[in-house]
């Protein structure tokens, strides 16, 4: 075994090493001391380090692993957050333009029906955002408030224009035949199935990624252990104390502690795995109708289709609606 | 029957965008997404290895600290003496992760729970009672997946028309990306070191 | 003529419950969400609970969170609250309003006359 | 979830205006949310003035008018009414989609 070489008889290369982490502090002994007090560094012979001195640069060696840590996650972190960031600017970008596609869809063919039809349109596509972001809504809801809405304005716009403004309290009883007459056929129920699917796994894919970001957060700000603080400063420090400055840990010594101080974290990796494979298989999911940008941009032509069914069955319904809400003041409709 | 409502945007750069067959759609950013991601699967196990060559390992000099001594790269001493007498290790490993680090798992355990739910084969995945009275399926087909919207001639096919919307200065990974401050996307040569990381066994 | 008219008010000892109880009609009441509010004597308003139109999604103050619980019934066109656990606190004059929109909380158009629970011991 | 803040009194004489502030944070008047804001007599039931910021229903007057900016919400009445003199509660919801009130203003109209 190769004899360690002499320590520095004065302790002066030791001091002006710490002088570099501690200025002006007086904590090196002049020469080599017995060091019975150390608690980290145990000398076998006299050492150049103090108490203080220990204490110090175990501080100093948790914050070295912490921003390794730090240094370790930046690229991936930066991957997600700028990743969230963009996707739900991009998730919001594509309910605008639905939103403005239903409207000028309004706008072009069924121009009687707007301005209303722009106010329900727009508080639609808001509950589409909020659904987006986390919301506790039930999207059965919002589509049925939809074609609710929309119902009576189509009725007394399109298929009974000369409605005297008197008639117009029968907006009640028109909400009600809407569903129970089945007014619009199938495509409520067509756009709550292709919206509820889409918007739901828009909705896990953000929350999913918010969680990555939230993951590299908590990893990334880890205060390690007192215990882990000893075990680095041996590995890192307390050659300093025999004045053997230059010399580095051995390669697989440097493994065996950082296992160690990591081993809380290490156990991240399997769920971590899953996470990213079980992103993957979503992504590769995100097609047809469990694609967002598909589904409500396609939405004007459904919503479209759906007014156009109501116009075909005009006659029978005017007169179903007729005799049904003639007495809407007396009667409360279902 | 409906048409795309172009005229109703001012943005017409947008538009010019959304007929495009080649410009990047949002599905193509996921997958994108999806395959940097894949390169940090084994971040979390690569970590302790990742930090030893990024801290003052020797590598090239005969002799090493090994928390105890100076002693030769390649003797057993190397990796064992320095635990000696030291902290038990097997003892850190015992405790357990920090409440923080189990919270966490938790919440991973959870978000993998759904997204497997989300993940359910895609088969005919419409209500079947779609077809029954009251609804023309049109051109639509048995598989209702391939249509989006209602009937007949109102029918959009989504396939290749729904481009990505150039309103997004989008790609970030180009440092010169419109409104993409530079100092906000670490160069290459700040990053590649950690790139492979979740290559790393 | 549309109405909302509440019932099930009176006095109850801390930590009994109370179910109270609102009538609608004279509109489509499976197509409007439906909430609670509350106002104790002198005091200002205090939302109390909400219930989306199909009864699929519900939300609550977090001062009854856990103790309260919204229902409804659309067959019946009657709205409910079940108040479990009743404190002194919870004494107030107890409104039932119908929203404008189905799906969600916007604003209250209708609301009953209000009925008054008093929990004292 | 904290409830908007508004001003405890306001008053003016008849044919004067008087303007009422409701200041809410981000997460619920500052959102995309609409602030509705309600009238209501002593031992009676509030009224709906006001929803979706400036939209009134039929039946309230002209005088009562709203408008949304930012995170602030106000309600302006014009040409003052004995019989404007009441409580006036703004109303949003937040990100949750929870309902929050203003604590209530009482506006008296004096002489």
């Known amino acids: 075994q190769p004899p360690p070489p002499p320590p520095d008889a004065t302790c002066h290369q030791v001091r002006s090493f710490f002088q570099r982490l501690q200025p002006g502090l007086k904590w090196v002994p002049e020469t080599p001391v017995p060091g019975s007090d150390l608690q980290v560094c145990l000398p076998k012979g006299p050492t150049c380090c103090s108490r203080k001195m220990e204490e110090k640069y175990q501080l100093t060696a948790r914050l070295n692993m912490e921003q390794l840590l730090q240094s370790a996650s930046m690229e991936l972190k930066f991957l997600i957050i700028q990743n969230a960031a963009v996707f739900q600017e991009a998730f919001e970008i594509v309910v605008r333009h639905a939103k403005n596609y239903t409207n000028a869809m309004f706008k072009n063919n069924y121009p009687s029906l707007t301005p209303q039809a722009f106010e329900f349109v727009g508080e639609f596509f808001t509950d589409v955002s909020l659904y987006i972001l986390g919301s506790d809504i039930n999207v059965d809801d919002m589509v049925n408030e939809l074609f609710d809405s929309l119902f009576p304005v189509i009725y007394t716009q399109l298929m009974n224009p000369g409605l005297p403004d008197s008639a117009l309290d029968i907006n009640e009883c028109l909400r009600g035949a809407r569903r129970d007459l089945k007014v619009f056929g199938n495509f409520p129920k067509l756009i709550m199935t292709q919206v509820s699917k889409s918007l739901q796994v828009t909705r896990i894919f953000l929350q999913a990624l918010n969680l990555g970001i939230e993951v590299i957060n908590t990893t990334d700000h880890l205060k390690f252990s007192k215990d882990c603080g000893r075990m680095l400063t041996r590995m890192w420090y307390c050659s300093y104390c025999q004045g053997l400055m230059m010399v580095k840990p051995c390669g697989g010594y440097c493994n065996v502690v950082m296992q160690g101080c990591m081993a809380g974290v290490v156990e991240i990796d399997k769920y971590w795995r899953e996470y990213i494979l079980s992103l993957e298989e979503l992504v590769n999911g995100m097609y047809r109708i469990y694609d967002m940008e598909n589904v409500l941009l396609g939405l004007f032509s459904t919503i479209h289709d759906s007014i156009q069914y109501v116009q075909k069955n005009a006659g029978k319904l005017t007169t179903t609606i007729g005799k049904l809400c003639a007495h809407s003041q007396q009667r409360q409709y279902r | 029957s409906a048409y795309y409502p172009e005229d109703l945007f001012i943005d017409k750069k947008v538009l010019k965008v959304a007929h495009v067959e080649h410009e990047e759609t949002l599905s193509s950013r996921r997958r994108e997404l999806i395959q940097k991601l894949k390169s940090f699967i084994s971040f979390y196990s690569a970590l302790p290895g990742y930090i030893c060559s990024h801290s003052p390992v020797a590598e090239n000099d005969t002799l090493c600290w090994n928390g105890q001594e100076l002693v030769e790269r390649y003797s057993q001493k190397a990796a064992r003496n320095g635990m000696k007498n030291q902290f038990n290790l097997h003892e850190l490993k015992m405790k357990g992760p920090e409440p923080v680090v189990s919270q966490i798992i938790d919440k991973l355990k959870h978000i993998n729970q759904l997204l497997r739910t989300m993940s359910m084969p895609k088969g005919r995945v419409l209500d079947k009672n779609l077809d029954e009275e009251g609804f023309e399926s049109g051109d639509c087909g048995d598989d209702e997946d391939e249509c989006i919207g209602g009937s007949g001639d109102g029918m959009i096919k989504v396939k290749n028309q729904l481009r990505f919307l150039a309103e997004l200065a989008y790609d970030l990974d180009v440092d010169d990306a419109p409104g993409n401050s530079q100092q906000a996307t670490p160069k290459d040569n700040e990053i590649s070191t950690f790139h492979n990381l979740g290559n790393v066994h | 003529q549309v109405q909302l008219q509440e019932s099930g008010g009176g006095l109850v000892q801390p930590g009994r419950s109370l179910r109270l109880s609102c009538a609608a009609s004279?509109?489509?009441?499976?197509?409007?969400?439906m909430h609670w509010v509350r106002q104790a004597p002198g005091k200002g308003l205090e939302w109390v609970s909400a219930i989306s139109s199909s009864g699929g999604s519900t939300y609550y103050a977090d001062s009854v969170k856990g103790r309260f619980t919204i229902s409804r019934d659309n067959s019946k066109n009657t709205l409910y609250l079940q108040m479990n656990s009743l404190r002194a606190e919870d004494t107030a004059v107890y409104y039932c309003?119908?929203?404008?929109?189905?799906?969600?909380?916007?604003?209250?158009?209708?609301w009953g006359q209000g009925t008054l629970v008093t929990v004292s011991s | 979830q904290s409830a908007l803040t508004q001003p405890p009194s306001a008053s003016g004489s008849p044919g004067q205006s008087v303007t009422i502030s409701c200041t809410g944070t981000s997460s619920d008047v500052g959102l995309m949310h609409n602030v509705s804001w309600y009238q209501q007599y002593p031992g009676k039931a509030p009224k709906l003035l006001i929803y979706k910021s400036s939209s009134r229903p039929s039946g309230v007057p002209d005088r009562f008018s709203g408008s949304k900016s930012g995170t602030s919400a106000s309600l302006a009445i014009t040409g003052l009414q004995a019989e404007d003199g009441a409580d006036y509660y703004c109303?949003?919801?937040?990100?949750?989609?929870?309902?929050?009130f203003g604590g209530g203003t009482k506006v008296t109209v004096l002489g």
């Open positions: 309003a119908k929203d404008r929109r189905g799906s969600h909380a916007d604003a209250f158009d209708v």
């Open positions: 109303q949003s919801y937040d990100s949750s989609l929870r309902v929050v």
């Open positions: 004279g509109f489509t009441f499976s197509s409007y969400a």
